[in-house]
């Protein structure tokens, strides 16, 4: 018995499309072997029409495709523009056509429903609007106009010109009689339901001289578009429902059990907790279209999504909708990266951001996810030297370690820095990752003075105390600027006395500025790193003033009196316009998993996709 399974019978009508899903055991061999769709001949052979290796028969050219979903153990054959010639017996299978790893499918394409003569066919999508036009003659101009629906053998009145409306159509139907010049009346039905489909009869007059017109209304349920994205990647649903619903609340929902479609996000401000920090609803265009970006795709995100428009901001019968079936590929090309990074007030975090290594020249960005309204992600820093004004001196985006990863360092942390941040580039939109920064109890590991004032022309020495846990790390001082932090020479002055219970492995490393000039004013960081992987940092602002008394300045920790929350940038710092991400290509991604490299106290944070084991920074 073959392990392949699928629909034994598929019945459709001419002009339609079919999507035939074939299921196979998702073993490693099966996932990667050839998939095919072939037509069985009278003599028992099976002629390939389409295969996963790119072959498409001339009979299927331009109207069929075969998509393999290895993670789910399925492949889907889509065939469009069906004709009766497509009726027959087929096989969907794996490997070689004659091998027997296949399933028999009978496809029957019929002519479609027989229609009465002079029947006008209206084909309209679910939730949309149809206008049924009904011509009449002059003698019936003043007579009653009506529309009936054929239910079984009997016509049932739907609406008439005397004001009757069938309860099934209340609030969504109207009868318009055109001006005297036009011998035509129209019935407009909004928010079409599947149950509205069927044969209609419009009539002017009630006697033997009445004018009648037959109409066949076909209400189409949207075929779900198949979307296949990588675990930890991102997906964008583009929803274009038409200008007629431009001012109606929009939503994206995910179908769960039965009839339920749980709102993921809507324009009324609702957002499902599972998507907190990793979803954005793009502002809609004038035509009512909008898009929703979900990052950090998880296995459980797979499923059927609907976008629609309804005043309630959720799915209701008659909502115009679009549908997607999202598959999440667990064999992801996107590496695991931390999803939660912990830091302490006054301390720092170093976040590793993955990007597509083929796009090393792309611009890198980091933005702060804001949940207000539909969500937005204003940029904080980019790799081209732009840093948001409020973050000057405490935020840096480094191209290191490179080869598919960049680093973002944020120091002088306060409770206000807690939240979700997105790593993204102007390249591959699938490589967008989300990291949550949590501020936890604890003291910063690196100790530096709070306020430092240097005197023009003199020498300044600024200490940085490193606890013994960093004994194996490279220690450095650098001067911060918009494009990074330029390394400066520093001196190891031996063990530090700033730590209780810390042995000879603690270190005091000083930055010395000789013959201070105005150009020396600014932010200085001391930090630790291992190769190209950065750990904790501490920041000091050095102000430069005129000489008052001779000599050099040696700053001690006693002067570190400013609390981290009190650090305020000089008002003279230039203000750069707040950049917010509008382009959906610049939206971000993801919740990821443990980084195996245990760095220092973990200011890089090793984390899991559900954030159940979070590793913190600056606190151990």
């Amino acid at each position: 018995k073959s392990p392949i399974f699928g629909p034994e019978e598929v019945n459709s009508v001419e002009g339609n499309s079919v999507s035939i899903t074939c299921y196979y055991p998702p073993t490693s061999v099966n996932r990667h072997t050839r998939k095919y769709w072939c037509r069985q001949g009278a003599r028992g052979g099976c002629i390939t029409l389409i295969s996963s290796e790119g072959y498409v028969s001339s009979k299927y050219a331009g109207r069929a495709n075969l998509t393999n979903f290895p993670e789910n153990g399925t492949f889907v054959v889509n065939i469009a523009q069906l004709s009766q010639d497509d009726s027959g017996r087929y096989k969907c299978g794996l490997g070689i056509n004659s091998r027997g790893l296949s399933f028999d499918v009978s496809l029957e394409v019929s002519q479609g429903p027989g229609l009465l003569n002079d029947t006008k066919v209206y084909t309209v999508d679910l939730g949309r609007t149809v206008t049924i036009n009904c011509p009449f003659k002059t003698e019936n101009a003043q007579k009653r106009k009506s529309l009936y629906k054929q239910i079984g053998l009997y016509p049932v009145l739907v609406i008439d010109s005397s004001g009757y409306v069938n309860p099934n159509y209340t609030g969504r139907i109207r009868l318009d009689i055109q001006g005297t010049g036009q011998l035509l009346f129209s019935v407009v039905i909004n928010q079409l339901r599947l149950s509205d489909a069927g044969q209609y009869l419009c009539q002017a007059g009630d006697d033997s001289n009445s004018n009648k017109k037959n109409a066949d209304l076909q209400v189409l349920k949207p075929e779900p578009e198949l979307v296949y994205e990588d675990l930890r990647g991102s997906v964008t649903f583009h929803c274009a429902l038409g200008p007629e619903v431009a001012n109606v609340a929009k939503f994206l929902c995910r179908q769960s059990s039965g009839e339920n479609c749980d709102v993921v996000v809507n324009t009324l401000g609702k957002r499902a907790p599972a998507f907190e920090g990793r979803i954005l609803l793009n502002p809609q265009d004038k035509d009512g279209s909008f898009s929703v970006v979900i990052t950090g795709l998880r296995k459980e995100d797979a499923g059927r999504y609907l976008c629609g428009a309804h005043s309630d901001g959720q799915l209701q019968e008659g909502s115009p909708i679009q549908a997607w079936q999202l598959f999440v590929n667990e064999e992801s090309t996107i590496p695991r990266s931390p999803t939660v990074v912990k830091g302490v007030a006054g301390g720092s975090v170093a976040v590793l951001c993955p990007y597509n290594r083929k796009e090393s020249k792309s611009i890198k960005y980091w933005c702060l996810w804001e949940g207000a309204q539909n969500g937005r992600c204003p940029l904080l820093v980019d790799s081209e030297g732009w840093v948001k004004a409020q973050y000057e001196g405490r935020l840096s985006l480094l191209e290191e370690p490179g080869n598919g990863t960049f680093t973002v360092i944020l120091n002088q942390l306060t409770s206000r820095d807690a939240g979700f941040y997105w790593c993204l580039t102007n390249g591959d939109t699938l490589w967008r990752t989300t990291v949550e920064i949590k501020i936890i109890e604890g003291e910063p590991n690196l100790k530096v003075p709070g306020n430092v004032t240097a005197v023009l022309g003199e020498t300044l020495k600024v200490p940085c105390h490193f606890p013994c846990k960093f004994s194996s790390y490279e220690k450095y001082w650098c001067k911060w600027n918009n494009t990074g932090c330029q390394a400066l020479p520093s001196q190891d002055e031996g063990p530090s006395k700033a730590f209780v219970n810390c042995d000879e492995n603690s270190r005091l490393v000083s930055l010395t500025l000789n013959l201070v000039t105005r150009a020396d004013e600014g932010w200085y960081w001391c930090g630790v790193k291992q190769g190209h992987f950065y750990g904790e940092t501490a920041a000091v602002y050095v102000a430069v003033e005129e000489r008052k008394a001779a000599g050099s300045r040696d700053v001690s920790l006693a002067k570190a009196d400013a609390a981290p929350d009190e650090k305020v940038l000089d008002s003279g710092f230039r203000e750069i316009e707040n950049k917010a991400i509008q382009d959906p290509r610049l939206f971000a991604e993801e919740k990821a998993v443990a980084d195996t490299r245990d760095q220092a106290d973990g200011s890089r944070a090793s984390v899991d996709s559900g954030s159940s084991e979070e590793q913190g920074g600056s606190s151990r």
Partner: nanobody, 127 residues
């Protein structure tokens, strides 16, 4: 709460026929798939047949090997009803037959993908 209600079960002789019906008045456009499952005494519930309708005049019918060629699943969308016509019945077809509905278009044989279930109708085939 959306409900489905089965009917048409009963006692039939081997070789006979039976037509089961499942009414799902509460299900609207999102009920893409309706399925039949059965459970014999002391056995696990197993897939029998399923039918999808894509809203555009296309039907997909799935059958278990055990009933292939002897059963036909169909649905009347106007009545929100699905039917299972069973012919050439065998004693081993004796079971409680359940109707189920799902919006999840994964493998139709997987029980836990069906969110809505009926109470079942007993089919007994005597030899």
């Amino acid at each position: 709460e959306v409900q489905v209600v089965e009917s048409g079960g009963g006692l039939v002789q081997a070789g006979g026929s039976l037509k089961l019906a499942c009414a799902a008045p509460g299900l609207t456009f999102s009920s893409y798939r309706m399925g039949w499952f059965r459970q014999a005494p002391g056995q696990e519930r197993e897939f029998v047949a399923a039918i999808d309708w894509n809203g555009r005049g296309t039907y997909y019918r799935y059958y278990a090997d055990s009933v292939k060629g002897r059963s036909t699943i169909s649905r009347d969308n106007a009545k929100n009803t699905v039917y299972l016509q069973m012919n050439s019945l065998k004693p081993e077809d004796t079971a409680v037959y359940y109707c189920a509905a799902t919006t999840v278009l994964t493998d139709p044989r997987v029980l836990n993908e069906y969110a809505t279930w009926g109470q079942g109708t007993q089919v007994t085939v005597s030899s």
